[in-house]
Interface confidence: low
């Protein structure tokens, strides 16, 4: 089943997020992803937990998952590299790098996104953009076209309250508000973009979506700069 989602958002402007990727399993959308280099897509490690022997591919240049678009292209995956410390039962280190079978053909609708290397928290209240093909309502309706929503960053102290995530949010994670607008099932692995820079990746835990007391959790990419660089090298 798809992991993660966009609730309370709207359809994105077509191809305005050329870094956006759909990680697909046997031809169906599974998770979001973000193109970080010509031949590499960053996503969430938990996305491949259910993949087993299925065929994993990456769709780039897409707005609609089903309609023909000149910029769309499906790439095979040469290598999948989950973070070595990721584990099935925790949200920590939930990152995955997918090496495409060849360098992506870049153009206006396909382009890598710079990612944050400076390891400092995004200021609380900063509006960040999250996009994906995840479910758009609690009935589980899946969109065909890319959705997005702007979410304010939530400070870690609030996110770690007993009533919220009760201390689970380490310095390597960040939170965004989730009051009716939220990332959800099918959005996991997708980008949280603040000021035009990739700051976070949607985690793929089975969190309730759209509940303000259960903020969205995102893996801070800056905290994993050394690992990302080592894999991409």
């Amino acid at each position: 089943p798809p992991r993660g989602r966009i609730l309370g958002g709207r359809e994105a402007e077509a191809h305005a997020r050329p870094y956006m990727a759909s990680v697909q399993l046997n031809g169906a959308h599974l998770c979001g992803g973000v193109l970080v280099a010509e031949q590499w897509v960053l996503s969430a490690a938990h996305c491949l937990e259910d993949a087993a022997d299925g065929k994993v591919q990456v769709l780039l240049g897409a707005h609609s998952l089903s309609q023909p678009e000149p910029s769309k292209r499906l790439y095979d995956v040469l290598r999948a590299v989950p973070h070595p410390d990721s584990q099935p039962d925790t949200i920590d280190h939930d990152l995955l790098l997918l090496q495409l079978s060849e360098k992506a053909t870049l153009g206006p609708a396909v382009r890598p996104l710079p990612w944050q290397r400076v390891d400092r928290d995004v200021a609380p209240g900063t509006l960040c953009d999250v996009a994906g093909w995840g479910i758009v309502n609690h009935a589980g309706r899946r969109p065909d076209s890319l959705q997005h929503v702007l979410l304010p960053v939530l400070d870690r102290a609030t996110c770690n309250r007993r009533t919220h995530h009760d201390g689970a949010i380490t310095e390597r994670l960040m939170c965004a508000e989730s009051n009716r607008r939220d990332s959800c099932k099918g959005d996991s692995g997708g980008p949280l973009v603040c000021g035009g820079v990739l700051e976070g990746v949607v985690t793929s835990g089975s969190r309730v979506c759209g509940n303000r007391k259960k903020p969205g959790i995102y893996t801070r990419v800056a905290s994993y700069a050394a690992w990302i660089d080592s894999v991409l090298a």
């Epitope: 710079p114 290397r117 400076v118 400092r120 928290d121 035009g196 820079v197």
Partner: antibody, heavy 117, light 107 residues
């Protein structure tokens, strides 16, 4: 090594505009934000704003919102700042500084702007 | 905007002395504080980032401490080349703001 080379001193009349440049080398220009800082003679430092050269996204100090315009040319790895409607208050040295690791860790040599009739 | 109040505004000390400059933020900035040194006629140079981390190439006689709203820069065993103006800067939220500076002179 990282270098930021700024354009030369400017002498301008009140009401005029100037555009200064900051050419980056020694790192991937599009991966890091470029900040601009003002220093009036004998005074302290003021943050003007930054640009993300990758997509041209800008963030300004409200104080400079109508004064400064930040742009960047990826092909030449050059950031620009245009100052408009100049007054004597704009006479200052303007620095570009890139935020690569932890703070504004690499600075240009500064561009001096003198506004005089 | 977050105000950064730096003190003292000027300071005179003898070679070999240990001196302390303080910076107070008008609201909590966690550890997002940097210290810069600007020698006369020169450009600012990063000394300390994230309140207490020494930037590459900076002598170990410089140290920083603090978190929240109160921060200090300490220079031990003052050297002639330390004559400069020192600025703190918060990186917690935009707009970034600097302290007013501390001008250090040798007695």
């Amino acid at each position: 090594q990282v270098q930021l080379q700024q354009s030369g001193a400017e002498l301008a009349k009140p009401g005029a505009s100037v555009k200064m440049s900051c050419k980056a080398s020694g790192y991937t220009f599009t991966n890091y934000w470029m900040h601009w800082v003002k220093q009036r003679p004998g005074q302290g430092l003021e943050w003007i704003g930054y640009i993300n050269p990758s997509i041209g996204y800008t963030e300004y100090n409200q104080k400079f919102k109508d004064k400064a315009t930040l742009t960047a040319d990826k092909s030449s790895s050059t950031a620009y700042m245009q100052l408009s409607s100049l007054t004597s208050e704009d006479s200052a040295v303007f620095y570009c500084a890139t935020f690569i690791y932890y703070a504004m860790d690499y600075w240009g040599q500064g561009t001096s702007v003198t506004v005089s009739s | 905007d977050i105000q950064m109040n730096q003190s003292p505004s000027s300071l005179s000390a003898s070679l070999g002395d240990t001196i302390t400059i303080t910076c107070h933020a008008s609201q909590n900035i966690n550890v997002w504080l940097s210290w810069y040194q600007q020698k006369p006629g020169n450009i600012p140079k990063l000394l300390i980032y994230k309140a207490s981390n020494l930037h590459t190439g900076v002598p170990s006689r410089f140290s920083g401490s603090g978190s929240g709203t109160g921060f200090t820069l300490t220079i031990s065993s003052l050297q002639p080349e330390d004559i400069a103006t020192y600025y703190c800067q918060q990186g917690q939220s935009y707009p970034y703001t600097f302290g007013g500076g501390t001008k250090l002179e040798i007695k």
